[in-house]
Interface confidence: medium
C-alpha cells in the first residue's frame, strides 16, 4: 500500500530508506539508488535520519558541486541550505559528500568507497 | 514531521516489524519495562539479515535474552532456549545479552545500556 | 603512485626571500588543496596556508598573512611558496601537502630545509 | 584560534604493547580530527583522519577514537616500525592547527 516500504527498505516520517552495508564509489551508489527507483539521500535537516544518529558510518549522499550554478546542488536541482553543514564553504568542490547521520559530514573523493542511502518519499 | 503507517509516529518499520529507536541508556530490566510500557518487547533478533540491520542503525543495544546464571541457559523473554552463540557467556557476572556490532555478548544486567523496542506487524 | 617533489635545501640572508617550489605527481593538483606547513627545529607543525588551484583561492593563518604568498600553476602540476623579509625565525623544514578532503593532509612532500644565516 | 594539547611528549613502551596517546582540543572540534607519524628521518604520513577513518595503505594496528574535545590514537600492538613522533591536528576552523607531538620511544 501508499504507507509501505518494499523489503529490505525502512519506513521513517512518511520515508523509506535504504541503507547498504556495501561500499561503493558516489557514482555507483547514484545508480544503485537509480535502478531502484530512488535517489540519493537528500537531507532536509540533519535530524533526519535521527533513528541512527549513533551510527559511526559515514554514507554518500545525493550532493554534488555545480561549476554551472557555483553551488552544491542535489540530485534535484534543489541548492544546499547554508544551514544543513556549516563548514560546507570549505567542502572541496571535486569532491562528493559522506554524511554522519549524527549530523557531520566529509568531502572525500567520489572514487573512494563508502556506504550509501537511498530515499523515496512515500507521499 | 508527518506520519504514516501501521508503526506508531517516531518508530521505525522495517521487514513487517516496528522498532523503537532508543537513545536512553537503562538497565536491562528498566528497558524491558520501558518497551512493556510501549506495548512491545524488548528487541528480538529473529535472523541473521536482522542483526546485520541493527548494527547498522545502532552500534549496542540490549537484547531480550537473559540466564538466570551462569550455569542456566540462555533464553529469550518467552521461556524459549535462545540458540545463537553469546559471546563471554562463562563469566558469572554477565546474565544479560546485548547485541555489538554484529554479534551478541553477555553484559552484566545492572549496566546502563540504550534499548530498542519491537513489535511485529 | 602519488608523490610530492619539492625544491632543494636553501640558505639565505635575512631580510631576503625564497621561493619554495612542490610538483604533484600522480594526481591532478586542481583535484586538491595544496598546503605548506612548516616545522621549526625540534618543534611541532605549523600550518602556514592552502591553495585551491582551480580556482586560486587561498586561505592563510594570520601569523603568516602577509608574510607567505602561496601560488600554483597547474600546467606544470606545481604549486609554490614564497616567504618574504626572512629572519632567524623562519629557519625551519618546509612540507608541502596535497589532500582531497578540506580538513585533512593526505600526501606530504619531503620536506625542504630553509637555513636563515648571514 | 583553537589550541590542541598532547601533555605528554614522550612515551617509552615495549614492542607488541597497546600503546595509546592522547590529544585535547581547546574547544569542540566536532570530530575533526587527524593523526600523522613523523619518522625520524622527517617523512610524515597520514595516519587517521575525522577521529576514526584509516587512511588507505594504513595498517589496522592502529585506530582513533573520541569526540568534543578529547581524542586518543591508539597503536593495539606495537611494532618497531612505529617508533615515531606523532601529531594531532584539528580540521574544524582554520586555522588548521596542529598538537606539540608525542614522540613514541621503545623501553
Known amino acids: 500500500d501508499c504507507c509501505s516500504c518494499q523489503e529490505k527498505w525502512v519506513g521513517y516520517r512518511c520515508n523509506c530508506y535504504f541503507i547498504s552495508s556495501e561500499q561503493k564509489t558516489w557514482n555507483e551508489s547514484r545508480h544503485l539508488c537509480a535502478s531502484q527507483k530512488s535517489s540519493l539521500l537528500q537531507l532536509q535537516n540533519t535530524d533526519e535520519l535521527d533513528f541512527m544518529s549513533s551510527s559511526q558510518q559515514f554514507y554518500w549522499i545525493g550532493l554534488s558541486y555545480s561549476e554551472e550554478h557555483t553551488a552544491w546542488l542535489w540530485e534535484n536541482g534543489s541548492a544546499l541550505s547554508q544551514y544543513l553543514f556549516p563548514s560546507f564553504e570549505t567542502f572541496n568542490t571535486k569532491n562528493c559528500i559522506a554524511y554522519n547521520p549524527n549530523g557531520n559530514a566529509l568531502d572525500e573523493s567520489c572514487e573512494d568507497k563508502n556506504r550509501y542511502i537511498c530515499k523515496q518519499q512515500l507521499i | 514531521a508527518r506520519h504514516c503507517g501501521h508503526c506508531p509516529e517516531e518508530w521505525i518499520t522495517y521487514s513487517n516489524s516496528c522498532y523503537y529507536i532508543g537513545k536512553e541508556r537503562r538497565t536491562w530490566e528498566e528497558s524491558l519495562l520501558a518497551c512493556t510500557s510501549k506495548n512491545s518487547s524488548l528487541l528480538s533478533i529473529d535472523n541473521e539479515e536482522e542483526m546485520k540491520f541493527l548494527s547498522i542503525i545502532s552500534p549496542s543495544s540490549w537484547i531480550g535474552v537473559f540466564r538466570n546464571s551462569s550455569h542456566h541457559p540462555w533464553v529469550t523473554m518467552n521461556g524459549l532456549a535462545f540458540k545463537h552463540e553469546i559471546k563471554d557467556s562463562d563469566n558469572a557476572e554477565l546474565n544479560c545479552a546485548v547485541l555489538q556490532v554484529n554479534r551478541l555478548k553477555s553484559a552484566q544486567c545492572g549496566s546502563s545500556i540504550i534499548y530498542h523496542c519491537k513489535h511485529k506487524l | 603512485e602519488v608523490q610530492l617533489q619539492q625544491s632543494g635545501a636553501e640558505l639565505v640572508m635575512p631580510g631576503a626571500s625564497v621561493k619554495l617550489s612542490c610538483t604533484a605527481s600522480g594526481f591532478n593538483i586542481k583535484d586538491t588543496y595544496m598546503h605548506w606547513v612548516m616545522q621549526r627545529p625540534e618543534q611541532g607543525l605549523e600550518w602556514i596556508g592552502r591553495?585551491?588551484?582551480?580556482?586560486?583561492?587561498?586561505n592563510y593563518d594570520p601569523r603568516f598573512q602577509g608574510k607567505a604568498t602561496i601560488t600554483a600553476d597547474t600546467s606544470s602540476n606545481t604549486a609554490y611558496l614564497q616567504f618574504s623579509s626572512l629572519t632567524s625565525e623562519d629557519t625551519a623544514v618546509y612540507y608541502c601537502v596535497g589532500g582531497r578532503g578540506h580538513t585533512w593532509f593526505a600526501y606530504w612532500g619531503q620536506g625542504t630545509l630553509v637555513t636563515v644565516s648571514a | 584560534d583553537i589550541q590542541m594539547t598532547q601533555t605528554t611528549s614522550s612515551l617509552s613502551a615495549s614492542l607488541g604493547d597497546r600503546v595509546t596517546i592522547s590529544c585535547r582540543a581547546s574547544?569542540?572540534?566536532?570530530?575533526?580530527l587527524n593523526w600523522y607519524q613523523q619518522k625520524p628521518d622527517g617523512t610524515v604520513k597520514l595516519l587517521i583522519y575525522y577521529t576514526s577513518r584509516l587512511h588507505s595503505g594504513v595498517p589496522s594496528r592502529f585506530s582513533g577514537s573520541g569526540s568534543g574535545t578529547d581524542y586518543s590514537l591508539t597503536i593495539s600492538n606495537l611494532e618497531q616500525e612505529d617508533i615515531a613522533t606523532y601529531f594531532c591536528q584539528q580540521g574544524n576552523t582554520l586555522p588548521y592547527t596542529f598538537g606539540g607531538g608525542t614522540k613514541l620511544e621503545i623501553k
Open positions: 591553495i585551491d588551484p582551480a580556482n586560486v583561492n587561498t
Open positions: 574547544q569542540d572540534i566536532t570530530n575533526y
